[in-house]
């Protein structure tokens, strides 16, 4: 129903704490360079204004839309043009164009330093002094680096952070309590970020229909006992929630997500037998839990899919009658039978089925034409299955770091024009798929691997869009989202690439590398590996291994030396010479 004051309505629904958190996230995602203090000031002003509207919905400006209120706040920031350049031009526009303009200026790769975690004692001190400010900083720092982070889920991660600090700061050994727990939250949050970015990309590039298809497949896998009408209702609601969050309407998004969680918990009987544990939790944990709830047990008596979609005489009539509903039913029926497939694969199969009906239903004898459609799915299913087997075998053989290196070589050969930092980031993320998915039971590997890879490759595409340098990448990123991963997998060495000149300084290292944390050391070595491949794109795996082993040995020797600087300056040039010879 319509409310006199939208801001009062959302404040009442969400409560002050969540309201403030969401407004802070919204501002941080729009203006990514502003400091925490600048945003905190704006948040307080918006909250005070919301309270006046709660007290009197007819008060001045309380009837304005949230976009108008928030946009006016952002546009009133001093030095907007100096700090944000052309983003300031958005302020000359009227709503809804102004908000669209802000959205277009969100930067997926802002030039901000990595979010460094303070050491345990310092963290606990500032947390104890002011937990609210501490958590505000967390929301601000994550949101500005991840401008499409799913806002209600970020509140959940902040809550997790809070609970970990409350527990660990009371312990004697704070460091060993905090580090693994916070690393766990960080890892989950980063995965959540790339997954949500993929959803927003789907919405932005292909519209609500594409996202809804994704939701139907995903929900049908998780809730195979729910009927099509129930799945459609959930998919429609979920699409609305995600559209709002991707569009910067974070208060509406969080409010509607809470409503959806409430609906699911009130209708467990028609949705799934697995929801009760989630439904017993408080709001943020409940919604998070529902989003990753285990699949319900599949009904035992499901008829073969062919009955309704191949053998039924009415296939073309049903398709003609309501194309989207018929294809939606196909996607639902196929997905609920295949929790072992990735959503991307299910969508590819639905697309293949649609193309087959488009072709066959126009023929004089459609049944003879579409009768083999299910057999034609086989190569589409085999391709990702082989991908999973090959990559998991390689991961098990090499371990995470070695697996990342293998991917780095592969992707540098596919797209050597891409910047080395982007290639290293992509390979490290792609390589984590091994640890994340290859240890899972067989029937969970494919959905885990392919949907995770798709999300990471979406980020590669977003970064490449800013500065397009590789025709290979442009080709794969231009197609539909579900075809991207197979497209990247099929890429081979880019024959058009002119190898980079060998520059000794690229492979010159200093003793400061010895004190770097292990992760930073790995990144330095992987940067060198990518540069080697750019120098010799057709180097064999053996050649590259020889060079990298030599490099590792060099680092180990010099970092253990009494006079590290001398070791680096004398042994370094020898290493460079040996590298050149090995790759000659």
């Amino acid at each position: 129903e319509a409310h006199k004051s939208e801001i009062a309505h959302r404040y009442n629904d969400l409560g002050e704490q969540h309201f403030k958190g969401l407004v802070l996230i919204a501002f941080s995602q729009y203006l990514q360079k502003c400091s925490y203090d600048e945003h905190a000031k704006l948040v307080q002003e918006v909250t005070d204004f919301a309270k006046t509207c709660v007290a009197d919905e007819s008060a001045a400006n309380c009837d304005k839309s949230l976009h108008t209120l928030f946009g006016d706040k952002l546009c009133a920031i001093p030095n907007l043009r100096e700090n944000y350049g052309e983003l300031a031009d958005c302020c000359t526009k009227q709503e809804p164009e102004r908000n669209e303009c802000f959205l277009q200026h969100k930067d997926d790769n802002p030039s901000l330093p990595p979010f460094e975690r303070p050491e345990a004692e310092a963290m606990c001190t500032s947390f104890k002094e002011n937990p609210t400010t501490f958590m505000g900083h967390y929301l601000h720092e994550v949101a500005r680096r991840h401008p499409y982070f799913y806002a209600p889920e970020l509140l959940y991660y902040a809550e997790q952070y809070n609970e970990i600090l409350t527990q660990c700061c009371a312990e004697a050994d704070k460091e060993s309590c905090l580090t693994p727990k916070l690393d766990g939250v960080k890892e989950k949050a980063l995965v959540s970020s790339v997954r949500q970015r993929m959803k927003c990309s789907s919405m932005q590039k292909f519209g609500e229909r594409a996202f809804k298809a994704w939701a139907v497949a995903r929900l049908s896998q998780t809730f195979p006992n729910a009927d099509f009408a129930e799945i459609t209702k959930l998919a429609t609601d979920l699409t609305k929630v995600n559209k709002e969050c991707c569009h910067g309407d974070l208060l509406e998004c969080a409010d509607d997500r809470a409503e959806l969680a409430k609906y699911m918990c009130e209708n467990q009987a028609t949705i799934s037998s697995k929801l009760q544990t989630c439904c017993d939790k408080p709001l943020l944990k409940k919604a998070h839990c529902l989003s990753e709830v285990e699949h319900d047990t599949m009904p035992a008596d499901l008829p073969a899919i062919a009955a309704d979609f191949v053998e039924d005489q009415e296939v073309c009539k049903n398709y003609a009658e309501a194309k989207d509903v018929f294809l939606g039913t196909f996607l639902y029926e196929y997905s609920r039978r295949h929790p072992d497939y990735s959503v991307s694969l299910l969508l590819r199969l639905a697309k293949k089925y649609e193309a087959t009906l488009e072709k066959c239903c126009a023929e004089a004898n459609p049944p003879a034409c579409y009768g083999t459609v299910l057999a034609e799915f086989q190569p589409l299913v085999e391709e990702p299955k082989n991908l999973v087997k090959t990559n998991c075998d390689l991961y098990e053989k090499l371990g995470e770091y070695g697996f990342q290196n293998a991917i780095l070589v592969r992707y540098t050969q596919k797209a050597p024009q891409v910047s080395t930092p982007t290639l290293v980031e992509a390979a490290r993320n792609l390589g984590r798929v091994g640890t994340k998915c290859c240890t899972l039971p067989e029937d969970q590997r494919l959905p885990c691997v392919e949907d995770y890879l798709s999300a990471i490759l979406n980020r590669v595409c977003l970064l490449h869009e800013k500065t397009p340098v590789s025709e290979h990448v442009t080709k794969c990123c231009s197609g539909s989202l579900v075809e991207r991963r197979p497209c990247f997998s099929a890429l081979t060495v880019d024959e058009t690439y002119v190898p980079k000149e060998f520059k000794a300084e690229t492979f010159t290292f200093h003793s400061d590398i010895c004190t770097l944390p292990e992760k930073e050391k790995q990144i330095k070595k992987q940067t060198a590996l990518a540069e080697l491949v750019k120098h010799k794109p057709k180097a064999t795996a053996e050649q590259l291994k020889t060079v990298m082993d030599d490099f590792a040995q060099f680092l180990d020797t010099c970092c253990k030396a009494a006079d590290k600087d001398t070791c680096f300056s004398t042994e370094g040039p020898n290493l460079v010479t040996r590298c050149k010879d090995a790759l000659a």
Partner: nanobody
Amino acid sequence: KVQLVESGGGLVQPGGSLRLSCAASGFTFSSFGMSWVRQAPGKGPEWVSSISGSGSDTLYADSVKGRFTISRDNSKNTLYLQMNSLRPEDTAVYYCTIGGSLKQSSQGTLVTVSS
């Protein structure tokens, strides 16, 4: 909603001719192959003829080959069946269907061949 309305049936003497029409609405007519199906009193449905969406391909049951001609006008969303040299055994209710289906979802038009 898909709608198919047949017309043109009637009483005709053996050896005579009739032209049946089927007006289609509620779907993209030119994207779908269409068929004529008939059902004689007390019998099951029998496929008569089919035509592709573009009209370039046609198929006929052996019992009507050389006597019946199926055609379509996509600009008018209409399917036709020209029936020549009619025989008593052609007596049936004729239905048009989408995509080779034998199920009737319309009223049909009655063709009676009798002297």
